[in-house]
């Protein structure tokens, strides 16, 4: 019958001619009277046999990542004759792995978006890598993940790629941060391949900034002869936060007189001061009252942040009319 | 590193000018407004000036305004205070301070969250 | 606009120091507090009453309420000698308060 061990040859391999092992009939008794034959893909081209000894080189350098088994039949015949001396058998040689392909993040551009103040611990997004080389083989294809830019704000779990918020992020400080995240094969043993890709981090809004009034005082005129519903003038206050964080509903929060009113302009977030009841310069020529400016809506948990509202003090000077 | 570095400053008599730099870098230089902090030796910090990112404003303290000019080029990452008519009072260590918050916000929300080592002026005849 | 700080607070180590800086309606502003050592520019502690800023450890916390924002360093260390300056803005202008000494007896 025939007699061979396991066929395994490294892939990469540099030299002409790489021994691999040998295929031979327990019927050859070394007298040269057998001849060996291969047969099947990649034989004569990829691999060789000595026709004497059954001996079968490769001869071609592989890649086990292209391709990872040959299955090849073998012959030997009795030269005196010219008949098989064994039935034609098939056998496999398999193509053995070696650390030559980096790890490669496949779904780049990683983008994600998680809500700023978030809390330590929080899953932004995971981040995986592959490796073409045989996951079956040692450490060559074992990966682990490491963070080269981002600290302190994100960090990474070193055996999924799952990037988790370490330090509490303000969006109107930073919107958006960059993150490097590299996978080392070999688990980060010497002789370790590795690959890197970058994830966009955008903050989105909370709203964790209250509105306050750029002017602590207004100075405001209204004529005597002005009709109620008349608009004296517009207030402003700022809030750094973005889309409905930032609405905002002003009111009056002191007016002994109950002479104006403060209504919301929601397309531009200002204030209008409106004449609620006619005013008489001969009576009173001058108002103070205050004005007060809180987000339109405020979660509870986002309470903290809106403590006190802000307020400014409007003085409105009436201006006289002559009257017949 | 993110760093601002002050330069110009120096022994000067009253009612003369002097400019002084403050050169950025580590950070895009004009996405920033940026303050000018002083202190008087032994003494408290008075904030000085202001100017946006894009130079669109500037706020001057009481104490300055008219004599005291701020302004920037975002093209040598550099922001300069120009004083005239300097007084004793104005004799301390200036500071650049970066306004903290990302462009587009106001900035009247935030402090300074990066500052130079200072540069002295003194006033004396 | 006029913010004002006690001159000086003294702490024993692993205390509780609480640093007030008050103003009119100060509540209703967003308020800053630097820490300052001997010889060194000054480094933001605390910014919007009560978030800290990226490296700054969380025994240092803000509140503001009324006329009154406070600064609270709790386990007081030695290396937390310092001046502290609160600071706020007024319309267009900024305003410090005149600093206070925290000494850790």
């Known amino acids: 019958g025939w007699v061979w061990n396991q066929f395994f040859v490294p892939e990469e391999m540099n030299t002409t001619s790489h021994h691999i092992g040998q295929l031979r009939s327990d019927l050859d008794n070394g007298n040269n009277s057998f001849q060996y034959k291969l047969l099947g893909a990649g034989a004569g081209s990829t691999f060789i046999i000595d026709e004497r000894t059954g001996d079968i080189y490769a001869i071609q350098k592989l890649d086990r990542e292209e391709r990872s088994l040959y299955i090849l039949r073998a012959q030997v015949i009795d030269i005196a004759t010219g008949r098989a001396v064994e039935p034609e058998s098939e056998f496999v040689i398999k193509v053995s792995d070696i650390n030559d392909n980096e790890p490669k993040f496949l779904d780049e551009p990683y983008e994600a978006i998680v809500p700023e103040m978030s809390p330590e611990g929080t899953l932004v997004i995971q981040v995986t890598a592959s490796d073409a080389d045989d996951p079956s083989s040692g450490n060559n294809a074992r990966l682990l993940y490491s963070l080269l830019q981002g600290q302190p704000y994100f960090s990474v779990e070193p055996t999924t790629g799952v990037i988790r918020i370490s330090s509490k992020m303000d969006r109107e400080l930073q919107d958006e941060y960059w993150v490097i995240i590299q996978a080392k094969d070999m688990i980060g043993q010497p002789g370790a391949l590795s690959g890197t890709t970058s994830v966009l981090i955008k903050l989105s809004d909370v709203n964790d900034n209250k509105p306050i009034f750029k002017e602590s005082l207004y100075r405001l005129t209204v004529s005597e002869s002005a009709p109620t519903g008349t608009s004296i003038g517009t207030i402003m206050a700022y809030d750094n936060d973005i889309g409905e964080n930032a609405e905002m509903d002003y009111s009056i929060e002191e007016d002994d007189s109950q002479t104006f009113d403060i209504i919301t302009n929601h397309e531009t977030q200002e204030g209008i001061v409106i004449l609620k009841k006619k005013v008489d310069f001969e009576h009173q020529n001058h108002y103070g009252i205050r004005a007060k400016v809180k987000n339109h809506h405020v979660p509870e948990q986002l309470m903290k942040y809106h403590t006190e509202a802000s307020t400014t003090f409007i003085k409105i000077q009436v201006e006289d009319v002559d009257e017949p | 590193q993110v760093q601002l570095v002050e330069s110009g400053g120096g022994v000067v008599q009253p009612g003369r000018s002097l400019r002084l730099s403050c050169a950025a870098s580590g950070f895009t230089f004009s996405r920033y407004g940026i303050h000018w902090v002083r202190q008087a030796p032994g003494k408290g910090l008075e904030w000085v000036a202001v100017?946006?990112?894009?130079?669109?404003?500037?706020y001057y303290a009481d104490s300055v305004k008219g004599r005291f000019t701020i302004s920037r080029d975002n093209s040598k990452n550099t922001l300069y205070l120009l004083m005239n008519s300097l007084r004793a009072e104005d004799s301390a260590v200036y500071y650049c301070a970066r306004r903290a918050g990302i462009p587009g916000t106001t900035g009247y929300y935030y402090g300074m969250d990066v500052w130079g080592q200072g540069t002295t002026v003194t006033v004396s005849s | 606009y006029e913010l004002t700080q006690p001159p000086s607070v003294s702490v024993s180590p692993g205390q509780t120091a609480s640093i007030t800086c008050s103003g009119d309606?100060?509540?209703?502003?967003?308020v800053y507090w630097y820490q300052q050592k001997p010889g060194q520019s000054p480094i933001l502690v605390i910014y919007q009453d009560n978030k800290w800023p990226s490296g700054i450890p969380e025994r240092f916390s803000g509140s503001n309420s009324g006329n009154t924002a406070t600064l609270t360093i709790s386990g007081t260390q030695a290396m937390d000698e310092a001046d502290y300056y609160c600071q706020a803005w007024d319309s267009s202008t900024v305003v410090f308060g005149g600093g206070t000494k925290l000494t850790v007896l």
């Open positions: 309606r100060l509540g209703e502003k967003y």
């Open positions: 100017i946006w990112y894009d130079g669109s404003n500037k």
